[in-house]
């Protein structure tokens, strides 16, 4: 740790405080994440160390690079490449100006490329949200904290006791499915796509049941026809209200037909029928994709 000079605190992630730091030997600017674990008194679990070490091999232009893992004095520090801003901040800064559609399209395309790569290596994110999508001034967007959920779990609250957001959580997780797939990341990305277009969260639930019911009110209450096996899921209740599906043109009105088609496939209830990242990249919505540069208010 003595090789790094902390420049400033840049955020408070799910697992601990995040600093902008400089490598004293190379001058490289990095993001330094101190991981706080419940088990800190007994040290960092060896399983977590193994999981994290595997993530160092995950090299892709749309994945935030894990540069180093520093395990000292029962504490764990993760050294990542540094990017200028997260998507949550960028969307907030764009609340009145909007994010231009070509940039939304570019961001979605890049994120799908990152997901396709990770999913092909059987690595899931599990906790995609605007806060862990990072952008730079050149128009790139990258997935951060990939695989950390498997290593450390997804807590109900952060280390600062903030509630971990449910807004981007797939319905199969909310319904208690223990063995979920890469499709959970596609759902999350679909929610983020809709949010970039409409400038508001698609399903801003404040509890697990509120989250589920917000999804049901928009997409209709799922049944065995649209999602075989749903009624057998651990947290499914036959008493769930039966809401009808809304027309997608009412859900994301500013989005064109291709965009709505892609989004509806990303938000398919049945994880087995939900579009894959690889298939999504071939969707007609991306036939005119470019890579515009964002106007960042840093």
């Amino acid at each position: 740790m003595e090789n790094f000079q902390k420049v400033e605190k840049i955020g408070e992630g799910t697992y601990g405080v995040v600093y902008k730091a400089r490598n004293k030997l190379t001058g490289e600017v990095v993001a330094l994440k101190k991981i706080r674990l419940d088990t800190e008194t007994e040290g960092v679990p060896s399983t977590a160390i193994r999981e994290i070490s595997l993530l160092k091999e995950l090299n892709h232009p749309n994945i935030v690079k894990l540069l180093d893992v520093i395990h000292t004095e029962n504490k764990l520090y993760l050294v990542f490449e540094f990017l200028h801003q997260d998507l949550k901040k960028f969307m907030d800064a764009s609340a009145l100006t909007g994010i231009p559609l070509p940039l939304i399209k570019s961001y979605l395309f890049q994120l799908l490329q990152g997901l396709a790569f990770c999913h092909s290596h059987r690595v899931l994110h599990r906790d995609l949200k605007p806060q862990n999508l990072l952008i730079n001034t050149e128009g790139a967007i990258k997935l951060a904290d990939f695989g950390l959920a498997r290593a450390f779990g997804v807590p109900v609250r952060t280390y600062t006791h903030e509630v971990v957001t449910l807004w981007y959580r797939a319905p199969e997780i909310l319904l208690g499915c223990k063995y979920y797939s890469t499709a959970v990341d596609i759902w999350s990305l679909g929610c983020i796509f809709a949010e970039m277009v409409t400038r508001r969260a698609l399903f801003p639930g404040d509890s697990e049941i509120d989250q589920l019911f917000r999804i049901f009110r928009t997409l209709g209450t799922p049944d065995e026809v649209v999602w075989p096996g749903v009624t057998s899921m651990p947290d499914y209740k036959p008493s769930f209200p039966k809401w009808a599906r809304q027309d997608f043109s009412k859900v994301v009105p500013p989005l064109d037909e291709d965009g709505r088609s892609l989004l509806s496939q990303m938000l398919h209830y049945d994880p087995n029928k939900r579009i894959s990242a690889k298939a999504a990249l071939a969707h007609p919505f991306f036939q005119d994709v470019t890579k515009p540069v964002p106007h960042l208010r840093l």
Epitope: D92, A95, G98, T198, R199, P253, P254
Partner: antibody, heavy 117, light 106 residues
Framework: EVQLLESGGGLVQPGGSLRLSCAAS????????MSWVRQAPGKGLEWVSG????????YYADSVKGRFTISRDNSKNTLYLQMNSLRAEDTAVYYC??????????WGQGTLVTVSS | DIQMTQSPSSLSASVGDRVTITCRAS??????LNWYQQKPGKAPKLLIY???SLQSGVPSRFSGSGSGTDFTLTISSLQPEDFATYYC????????FGQGTKLEIK
């Protein structure tokens, strides 16, 4: 029920200052971007300024840039517009409005600002 | 900056008439176009958002259409309470209002 109540308007001399307030109730104020829109007597609507919800990014129409400052106090559920170096052409009814994504869904009743010597 | 041009600026019509107001943007704004109704001494009221979506509580005689640069607001059968001023507004990038269309009783 969503309510927005503007206050702070009145008569002020050219070059003077005024601070408008907008008290919000009936919704989670901190979750919404907010805007000020004005309407000169007998004229159309003109967007003046806006502020984002979470980080408080601010935006201004060119006509008020450098003279007006928008701010919010989420703990008090209140939106503000500090108006300095006022001109006769700033005379208008000032409305505060809630921004719901990409449209303004709720508006206050307005407060009249008159700039005259 | 995006300019919005509304036409006509004023319009006389009778109860029961079908009325159309048009709005043109100086550049493409996709479907980021909203319509508001304002009565004298009152605050504007949202009618239509995203070019064609009816705001909750607004009568179905109001409808909107268009995409890109050209948009229309249609009132299928005018009611006495519809006589007011109507404004279009783009929200593609910041906000710009049209100059308004005053709908008067013939």
């Amino acid at each position: 029920e969503v309510q927005l109540l503007e206050s702070g308007g009145g008569l002020v001399q050219p070059g003077g200052s005024l601070r408008l307030s907008c008290a919000a109730s009936g919704f989670t104020f901190s979750s919404y971007a907010m805007s000020w829109v004005r309407q000169a007597p007998g004229k159309g609507l003109e967007w003046v300024s806006g502020i984002s919800s979470y980080y408080g990014y601010t935006y201004y129409a060119d006509s008020v840039k450098g003279r007006f400052t928008i701010s919010r106090d989420n703990s008090k559920n209140t939106l503000y517009l500090q108006m300095n170096s006022l001109r006769a052409e700033d005379t208008a009814v000032y409305y505060c409005a809630r921004v719901y994504g990409y449209y303004m869904d709720y508006w206050g009743q307005g407060t009249l600002v008159t700039v005259s010597s | 900056d995006i300019q919005m041009t509304q036409s006509p600026s004023s319009l006389s019509a009778s109860v029961g008439d079908r009325v159309t107001i048009t709005c043109r943007a100086s550049q493409s704004i996709s479907s980021y176009l909203n319509w508001y109704q304002q009565k004298p001494g009152k605050a504007p009221k949202l009618l239509i958002y995203a070019a064609s979506s009816l705001q909750s509580g607004v009568p179905s005689r109001f409808s909107g259409s268009g995409s890109g640069t050209d948009f229309t607001l249609t009132i299928s059968s005018l009611q006495p309470e519809d006589f007011a001023t109507y404004y279009c507004q783009q929200s593609s990038s910041l906000y710009t209002f049209g100059q308004g269309t005053k709908l008067e009783i013939k």
